[in-house]
């Protein structure tokens, strides 16, 4: 990119219509016959959706105003936010003694921005100051990108919480899940 990304310290998030559906119904799970039917969905932040393709790396559309100090864009910009999980849980339980350890059952993928686009926005400032033009970098698409255990913490921060996969032989902090831990991880699509 030949231009500097413009950092927005304050934005107003305006979710698009249709992003507030009713919560999903409870799923049934058989301990012996594990079934991953269409419709298994985890909670999403900040919204949930009934769309069966939801449990995946999804591109949520957000509309927001770009602000820079006292100045605000004349029109809101629409951008994508990458949301969701990339596949089933890839951690398998390892019972050692009385403690429960976890080990990976596959590479760890995270739903992250893939491509970006530049958009020029006009900022209106109070007190009759002249409008300013700025270029903002907006997410254009998302992908399920593989993480490695060699990613350092500063890199992981870019991928959001829960980005680090526990290494083999380590005892990780258990993930926060409800009583029915497996209910929320029944299906994905990439």
């Amino acid at each position: 990119q030949g231009w500097q990304a413009f950092k927005n310290d304050a934005t107003e998030i305006i979710p698009e219509l249709g992003e507030y559906p009713e919560p999903p119904p409870e799923l049934e799970n058989n301990k012996t016959m594990n079934r991953a039917e269409n419709g298994g969905r985890p909670p999403h932040h900040p919204f949930e959706t009934k769309d069966v393709s939801e449990y995946s790396c999804r591109e949520l559309h957000f509309t927001r105003y770009v602000t820079d100090g006292q100045c605000r864009s004349a029109k809101p910009v629409t951008e994508l936010v990458c949301s969701g999980q990339c596949g089933p849980a890839r951690l398998l339980p390892n019972a050692i003694g009385r403690g429960k350890w976890w080990r990976p059952s596959g590479p760890d993928f995270r739903c992250i921005p893939d491509r970006y686009r530049a958009q020029r926005v006009q900022l209106l400032c109070p007190g009759g100051a002249a409008p300013r033009a700025r270029k903002v970098r907006l997410v254009a698409s998302c992908k399920c990108k593989r993480l490695t255990r060699f990613h350092n913490q500063s890199e992981l921060k870019d991928f959001g919480p829960e980005a680090a996969r526990p290494q083999k032989g380590r005892k990780p902090r258990p993930r926060a899940r409800g009583a029915k831990a497996n209910q929320a991880e029944l299906e994905n699509a990439y």
Partner: antibody, heavy 123, light 107 residues
Framework: EVQLVQSGAEVKKPGASVKVSCKAS????????MHWVRQAPGQGLEWMGE????????GYNQKFKGRVTMTTDTSTSTAYMELRSLRSDDTAVYYC????????????????WGQGTTVTVSS | DIQMTQSPSSLSASVGDRVTITCRAS??????LNWYQQKPGKAPKLLIY???RLLSGVPSRFSGSGSGTDFTLTISSLQPEDFATYYC?????????FGGGTKVEIK
């Protein structure tokens, strides 16, 4: 010996469903995610998705979303792949494959494959 | 999806020849590249993983190299049992994708 043994060939009509099984032996079934890959006649390989035998959690290639369901029966160490609304271009050999791991290089690969199940979709 | 392009799609060679197959990814896949060999009517077999790591039991005449987007599988001295189709596969981004295959035939 680590082995994946798949069910026999199937002939189906367009619009029907097929369910292919893959029985694992020689290793702890719940220790590895199972993947499914297909190969149309004279074509390359196409990854369909994966399932975690512990949780039943599955992840599918978006191309097959809504038509495929992967399941496991841990009591018999068997994985299943059901494909619905079959079309003629679903005619292919369907493989189950185990995802192996190299701890040193933190890398994954399909190290054990089933022998393949031929599914023919024809009216 | 990441496109994996193999070249050539087929080649004719003789026993003892040095054979090189290339695989190009449409975007950077680091070293997450595997190579498989498939013979007619059989399932694919893993040869090389993580670009250059030879699976135990695979003859040392097979080698892999590359990183980022360009990768190579080399057979230093082709043997009769090596006539087959070879596929590359990326493991960097979901969905996993394979190359179109390179068929190695007897000249």
């Amino acid at each position: 010996e680590v082995q994946l043994v798949q069910s026999g060939a199937e002939v189906k009509k367009p619009g029907a469903s097929v369910k292919v099984s893959c029985k694992a032996s020689g290793y702890t079934f719940t220790d590895y995610n199972m993947h499914w890959v297909r190969q149309a006649p004279g074509q390359g390989l196409e990854w369909m998705g994966e399932i975690n035998p512990n949780s039943g959690g599955a992840g599918y290639n978006q191309k097959f979303k809504g038509r495929v369901t992967m399941t496991t029966d841990t009591s018999t160490s068997t994985a299943y792949m059901e494909l619905r609304s079959l079309r003629s271009d679903d005619t292919a050999v369907y493989y189950c494959a185990r995802l192996g791991y190299d701890d040193i290089y933190d890398d994954w690969y399909f190290d054990v494959w089933g022998q393949g199940t031929t599914v023919t979709v024809s009216s | 999806d990441i496109q994996m392009t193999q070249s050539p799609s087929s080649l004719s060679a003789s026993v003892g020849d040095r054979v090189t197959i290339t695989c190009r990814a449409s975007q950077d896949i680091s070293n997450y590249l595997n190579w498989y060999q498939q013979k007619p009517g059989k399932a694919p077999k893993l040869l090389i993983y993580h670009t250059s790591r030879l699976l135990s039991g695979v003859p040392s005449r097979f080698s892999g190299s590359g990183s980022g987007t360009d990768f190579t599988l080399t057979i230093s001295s082709l043997q009769p049992e090596d006539f087959a189709t070879y596929y590359c596969q990326q493991g960097d981004t979901l969905p996993y994708t394979f190359g179109g295959g390179t068929k190695v035939e007897i000249k």
